[in-house]
Interface confidence: low
Amino acid sequence: KVILDKYYFLCGQPLHFIPRKQLCDGELDCPLGEDEEHCVKSFPEGPAVAVRLSKDRSTLQVLDSATGNWFSACFDNFTEALAETACRQMGYSSKPTFRAVEIGPDQDLDVVEITENSQELRMRNSSGPCLSGSLVSLHCLACGKSLKTPRVVGVEEASVDSWPWQVSIQYDKQHVCGGSILDPHWVLTAAHCFRKHTDVFNWKVRAGSDKLGSFPSLAVAKIIIIEFNPMYPKDNDIALMKLQFPLTFSGTVRPICLPFFDEELTPATPLWIIGWGFTKQNGGKMSDILLQASVQVIDSTRCNADDAYQGEVTEKMMCAGIPEGGVDTCQGDSGGPLMYQSDQWHVVGIVSWGYGCGGPSTPGVYTKVSAYLNWIYNVWKAEL
């Protein structure tokens, strides 16, 4: 049976086997087409999600679809039901928390009172002044907190206590990529991890340990990638994996926060990378122990210079490394998080591509997660 399962897939109606390589090849090889059902699926960017959270204290903003203008949500008459609606619009199913925060002197958006219509937040028509003088600070999920804070050094062995959202994504029990837990059902990783194997069946996620071999494997229900853009073939290197059963959070299994929509990180901002990837370019082997390293944001202009990536780094990507080189992600780290710490840890990038590993002029290139928040929210909403 093990051999059969490894090399063959069982079609129903009538029962017969087909070679496993015929899974997810775009052709209906089973009469009912079940060989094409459990495959990596693409999902369009979708419409603009009409709510968002700002890095200014996680304050809620609402889109007026008629004008295309964004407004800050006033705390007046804001309720738990409105908080739940806002989070559902972003695809969250967990119980949100919210509080009032004072309108700051730098408030640049108009502040309006919020109401609900057809399970979407709307601006109240006759909205007067914001009497409370407060904005809504909203958290849809408790995220980005770890038991241990890493020390700021070059490269060192990591503990799962520091990075409880890190997972190993494995195909046929072999580590292929890293990934990050976003909520009980969802793991964030890179689309290119699934280029070779597009059948969901053999992919597993392992969470809760910093050692590659030692964690229980979790079944995957869906793998969703964003649609390919032929104009920018390296863009859209992002994927979401939906787990078959929700994770139970613990000290070693916790979610990382998504970035805020306006999370613009300036050059030299300190960031962290983690992974079980190759410890040497073109050789070495996967690290059995999770490794961590501190890096920094590298200016996109520098990254696109003639001696570096020559314009290949688009606005939906970001570069990170250290100016002198030597600290970088490598093969096997793909899909893992590039992380920024403010009050919580945020996954600002996904390990995507680069020339070599650790070269001074060719740092790691990462998918910029803030560029894909709309897509993530639309996928989650479709799967609620």
Epitope: G26, E27, L28, S42, E227, F228, P230
Partner: antibody, heavy 121, light 107 residues
Framework: QVQLVQSGAEVKKPGASVKVSCKAS????????MHWVRQAPGQGLEWMGI????????TYGHNFQGRVTMTRDTSTSTVYMELSSLRSEDTAVYYC??????????????WGQGTLVTVSS | EIVMTQSPATLSVSPGERATLSCRAS??????LAWYQQKPGQAPRLLIY???TRATGIPARFSGSGSGTEFTLTISSLQSEDFAVYYC?????????FGQGTKLEIK
């Protein structure tokens, strides 16, 4: 097996519009791009544009921009090509052709049987 | 856009003989070249893609070669069903463009 079945021949007057359909079967409809290619009588092949059935994104050839609209209906696995402001030089056989999803400008591995559109006053 | 030029316009060859069709691109298209066969009243059929890879179900007598700007389709031993019009198409640059065709006829 993969099949692309197109609607029947059409005769149109100059200035009118025509809408040709192409029904796909035998594969996952949203996993492949669909292109439209036309061939005037006794002439070569001319690429008109592409639609992504998964997200309905389109790219049209320069010669057809402003006159062509490509749409799809995922419930029936059908793509449509509408050409407006018809002129006599639009008389041609119009083909839908399937192309893999990993790159937009690509070989066409399966073709519809073609739909003859005649534009005549 | 890239202009594809096929030669000759018509090629007369006897059954059993070898036929060589040429296609030239106005600028490099790397190996992004396909060949199609079209018979009267039928849709084109993919023969070769990637300049040299035979499509599924295409007999081994069809072979493609070349890269950059010069490409060749060779039919090693012509069968009666091979007499048709052959088109080359580049897909290395948008929009994909076709050659004007080579008519392969019985000598």
């Amino acid at each position: 097996q993969v099949q692309l079945v197109q609607s029947g021949a059409e005769v149109k007057k100059p200035g009118a519009s025509v809408k040709v359909s192409c029904k796909a079967s035998g594969y996952t409809f949203t996993s492949y791009y669909m292109h439209w290619v036309r061939q005037a009588p006794g002439q070569g092949l001319e690429w008109m544009g592409i639609i992504n059935p998964s997200g309905a994104g389109t790219t049209y050839g320069h010669n057809f921009q402003g006159r062509v609209t490509m749409t799809r209906d995922t419930s029936t696995s059908t793509v449509y090509m509408e050409l407006s402001s018809l002129r006599s030089e639009d008389t041609a056989v119009y083909y839908c052709a399937r192309g893999p999803r990993d790159t937009a400008m690509v070989r066409f591995d399966y073709w519809g049987q073609g739909t003859l559109v005649t534009v005549s006053s | 856009e890239i202009v594809m030029t096929q030669s000759p316009a018509t090629l007369s060859v006897s059954p059993g003989e070898r036929a060589t069709l040429s296609c030239r691109a106005s600028q490099s298209v790397s190996s992004y070249l396909a060949w199609y066969q079209q018979k009267p009243g039928q849709a084109p059929r993919l023969l070769i893609y990637g300049a040299s890879t035979r499509a599924t179900g295409i007999p081994a007598r069809f072979s493609g070669s070349g890269s950059g700007t010069e490409f060749t389709l060779t039919i090693s031993s012509l069968q009666s069903e091979d007499f048709a019009v052959y088109y080359c198409q580049q897909y290395g640059s948008s929009p994909g463009t076709f050659g004007q065709g080579t008519k392969l006829e019985i000598k």
